[in-house]
């Protein structure tokens, strides 16, 4: 009696179970009662990443340099090419099909996480006691200067964008 289901890495065709092609190979002809499945390796710049019965391999992804993309990992017959973005740019999606510029954190904000090829800069507001007076993609919020440790007093309070201004203590004559 012909099978209704096949084992793992097999497929049902013409009432019989044929072996799937291994990753990196495509199907040329199905098996018969007398012959095995015929598979052929994927060509240059092609891949198949699963056990399959595909008659055509997939093209490797093209990392378009005009979009700021470059190859992070070259594809093989079993894996697709992985793209990333040039320095100063990051992917707009997980698939990394285009790139945008890294953002800077405005004054009053510090860098919580530096941008990478796949993620943008993450900024955070400077809390009380900290400041940032520059627009930067790298600088964290800096702590206000401690006037006390310098034997000075606060002459002007700090903000999230400015440091405190220290001055000499008033001496009693």
């Amino acid at each position: 009696e012909p099978p209704t289901a096949c084992r793992e890495k097999q497929y049902l065709i013409n009432s019989q179970c044929c072996s799937l092609c291994q990753p990196g190979q495509k199907l040329v002809s199905d098996c018969t009662e007398f012959t095995e499945t015929e598979c052929l390796p994927c060509g240059e710049s092609e891949f198949l990443d699963t056990w399959n019965r595909e008659t055509h391999c997939h093209q490797h992804k093209y990392c378009d340099p005009n979009l700021g993309l470059r190859v992070q990992q070259k594809g093989t017959s079993e894996t697709d090419t992985i793209c990333t973005c040039e320095e100063g740019w990051h992917c707009t999606s997980e698939a990394c099909e285009s790139c945008v510029l890294h953002r800077s954190c405005s004054p009053g904000f510090g860098v919580k996480q530096i941008a990478t090829g796949v993620s943008d800069t993450i900024c955070e507001p400077c809390p009380v006691g900290f400041f940032s007076n520059v627009s930067s993609a790298f600088e964290k919020c800096h702590p206000w200067t401690s006037c006390e440790t310098k034997d000075l007093v606060v002459q002007q309070a700090g903000t999230n964008k400015t440091d405190v201004v220290c001055g000499p203590q008033d001496r009693l004559r």
């Epitope: 700021g68 040039e86 740019w89 099909e97 945008v100 510029l101 930067s136």
Partner: antibody, heavy 112, light 112 residues
Framework: QSVEESGGRLVTPGTPLTLTCTVS????????MSWVRQAPGKGLEWIGI?????FTVYANWAKGRFTISKTSTTVDLKMTSLTASDTATYFC?????????WGPGTLVTVSS | DVVMTQTPASVSAAVGGTVTIKCQAS??????LAWYQQKPGQPPKLLIY???DLASGVPSRFKGSGSGTEFTLTINDLECDDAATYYC??????????????FGGGTEVVVK
């Protein structure tokens, strides 16, 4: 795929001017665009860039006086406080770290 | 900002000969460098990107090399049509988060 600049003309010093770059055959939400200028008989000078999400970066010398913005099919360069030294052909160019597609340019002459 | 110093300013060579143009960056830019060809009245045309990659449709007579701060454009088997001005262009993202796009001063190639 093409880009073409327009809006260049003779203006007097101090007059503001906006140049427009019209693109076809590709999406401005995917590609970054730069403005580059070239004074008569001189070399190329990068002005600034706008990315697919409309974020802009400018050359240090251009900050404050030049503004780049865009719509779905055009990229504008707004210039203020123009002087004779701004006389140049202004090019719109596509690309992130280099420029693979350029427009023919539009000539801006600043003279009293 | 990065400054690109291009040499020589002008070079002359015979048809079939070889021309070498050098570009020096004021600091290391890895390999993010492009070369352009510009003819009078035309926009620049991309020849090479990422220091050594040939742009689409550019003959293999054009060869880019170098990394860090020193880059070279070599034109072999010179043709009359190669007479033009050639520019290098760098892209640099600094560890302070600033962007720099800079062109070299240009090299005029005269074909005899």
């Amino acid at each position: 795929q093409s880009v073409e600049e327009s809006g260049g003309r003779l203006v007097t010093p101090g007059t503001p001017l906006t140049l427009t770059c019209t693109v076809s055959g590709f999406s401005l939400s995917t590609y970054a665009m730069s403005w580059v200028r070239q004074a008569p008989g001189k070399g190329l000078e990068w002005i600034g860039i706008i990315d697919g999400s409309s974020f802009t970066v400018y050359a240090n010398w251009a900050k404050g006086r030049f503004t780049i913005s865009k719509t779905s099919t055009t990229v504008d360069l707004k210039m203020t406080s123009l002087t004779a030294s701004d006389t140049a052909t202004y090019f719109c160019a596509r690309g992130a770290t280099f420029f693979g597609l350029w427009g023919p340019g539009t000539l801006v002459t600043v003279s009293s | 900002d990065v400054v690109m110093t291009q040499t020589p300013a002008s070079v002359s060579a015979a048809v079939g000969g070889t021309v070498t143009i050098k570009c020096q960056a004021s600091q290391s830019i890895s390999g993010v460098l492009a070369w352009y060809q510009q003819k009078p009245g035309q926009p620049p045309k991309l020849l090479i990107y990422r220091a050594a990659d040939l742009a689409s449709g550019v003959p293999s007579r054009f060869k880019g090399s170098g990394s860090g701060t020193e880059f070279t454009l070599t034109i072999n088997d010179l043709e009359c049509d190669d007479a033009a001005t050639y520019y290098c262009q760098s892209y640099y993202y600094s560890n302070s988060g600033s962007y720099s796009y800079a062109f070299g001063g240009g090299t005029e190639v005269v074909v005899k």
